[in-house]
């Protein structure tokens, strides 16, 4: 399975995607900056085995799906980008969850790692609260998609690591 | 490593142009903002504005809007600060420095060596 | 603009001293306040971000707190290599702007 090189690709086609999503000038909305504690720890470790990281990245764009498919996210987003955005991210999910897949019958370590699953999602639900304190504010909605553009980017370097342990 | 090289010093006539680099490497350039101050003989530091090198939109300070363009070219990773028409009061030494834009990390996390521009007849 | 305000101006101090650096800000900023240290002749280097964080590779003896409009930089123990000029910075809202600088000198 080789994931780590077709999800890099996948990777940075969302991130150009999400780089031509902007709406209005970032600087216009310097004050809105937010820490959401990007889950690092988690994309550190070399403990992990091919398919508990592939879980971790999974959830990761899982929930960038899910927070880019609301109908708030529908509201802010030029619908055809938004459009892109998500089959492009639907197609790393399907590609991961084959991978997993295949990857099961390889390794005897568990599928999931559950701590760093728990992670991911209360980074998630940080940024959605976030939202709704802002009242899903063009600028709040901003900071978001900078914030996503650098865990992607991040977890970019994870995955890139990954393909070096192959 | 990441490195932002500015170009070298300028002795310029007052009334000439001038347009000062500085480039940018290991990291990616479109990721962040690139900031310029200036600090005069003697004196503190003074911001003057800011680019994002991904589509080259620019913010300057009330203090220096008019008096000088900001630009980027990202596809040679390069911010520019230049002038039409330089004054004996624009000598001073002149910084870029990184910034993370709207993320929650370092301002100004990096910055050029300096650019030192001396204006005189 | 948000004007920015740093006490004192200068100082002496001798290695092994605390040394604490005020800045005041004209509005509330939240926690958008950076330091940054600068010796002669040399760029300016980052020591703390949002008000209270350490930048990387900087040394523990620096610390920094504060929220709203007061500011402080703390060096717990003075070092030689600490001998040069502090500036606060507010990076709240644009205009961004700097304080005027403290100078930090040996007794």
């Known amino acids: 399975c080789d994931l780590p090189q077709t999800h890099s690709l996948g990777n940075r086609r969302a991130l150009i995607l999400l780089a031509q999503m902007g709406r209005i000038s970032p600087f216009s909305c310097l004050k809105d900056r937010h820490d959401f504690g990007f889950p690092q720890e988690e994309f550190d470790g070399n403990q992990f085995q091919k398919a508990q990281a592939i879980s971790v990245l999974h959830e990761m764009i899982q929930q960038t799906f899910n927070l880019f498919s609301t109908k708030d996210s529908s509201a802010t987003w030029e619908q055809s980008l938004l459009e892109k955005f998500s089959t492009e991210l639907n197609q790393q999910l399907n590609d991961m969850e084959a991978c997993v897949i295949q990857e099961v019958g390889v390794e005897e370590t568990p599928l999931m790692n559950v701590d760093s699953i728990l992670a991911v999602k209360k980074y998630f639900q940080r940024i959605t609260l976030y939202l709704t304190e802002k009242k899903y504010s063009p600028c709040a909605w901003e900071v978001v998609r900078a914030e996503i553009m650098r865990s992607f980017s991040l977890s970019k370097i994870f995955q890139e690591r990954l393909r070096r342990k192959e | 490593e990441v490195q932002l090289v500015q170009s070298g010093a300028e002795v310029k006539k007052p009334g000439e142009s001038l347009k000062i680099s500085c480039k940018g490497s290991?990291?990616?350039?479109?990721?962040?903002?690139i900031g310029w101050v200036r600090q005069m003989p003697g004196k503190g530091l003074e911001w003057m504005g800011i680019?994002?090198?991904?589509?080259?939109?620019?913010r300057y300070s009330p203090s220096f809007q008019g008096q000088v363009t900001i630009s980027a070219d990202k596809s040679i990773s390069t911010a520019y600060l230049q002038w039409s028409s330089l004054k004996a009061s624009d000598t001073a030494m002149y910084y870029c420095a990184r910034h993370p834009g709207l993320n929650w990390a370092p301002d100004f996390d990096y910055w050029g060596q300096g650019t030192l521009v001396t204006v005189s007849s | 603009d948000i004007q920015m305000t740093q006490s004192p101006s200068s100082l002496s101090a001798s290695v092994g001293d605390r040394v604490t650096i005020t800045c005041r800000a004209s509005?509330?900023?939240?926690?958008?306040l950076n330091w940054y240290q600068q010796k002669p002749g040399k760029a300016p280097k980052l020591l703390i971000y949002f008000a209270s964080s350490l930048q990387s590779g900087v040394p523990s003896r620096f610390s920094g707190s504060g929220s709203g409009t007061d500011f402080t930089l703390t060096i717990s123990s003075l070092q030689p290599e600490d001998f040069a000029t502090y500036y606060c910075q507010q990076s709240f809202d644009f205009p961004l702007t700097f304080g005027q600088g403290t100078k930090v000198e040996i007794k």
């Open positions: 290991g990291y990616s350039f479109t990721s962040y903002w």
């Open positions: 509005q509330s900023i939240d926690r958008a």
């Open positions: 680019i994002d090198p991904s589509d080259s939109d620019t």
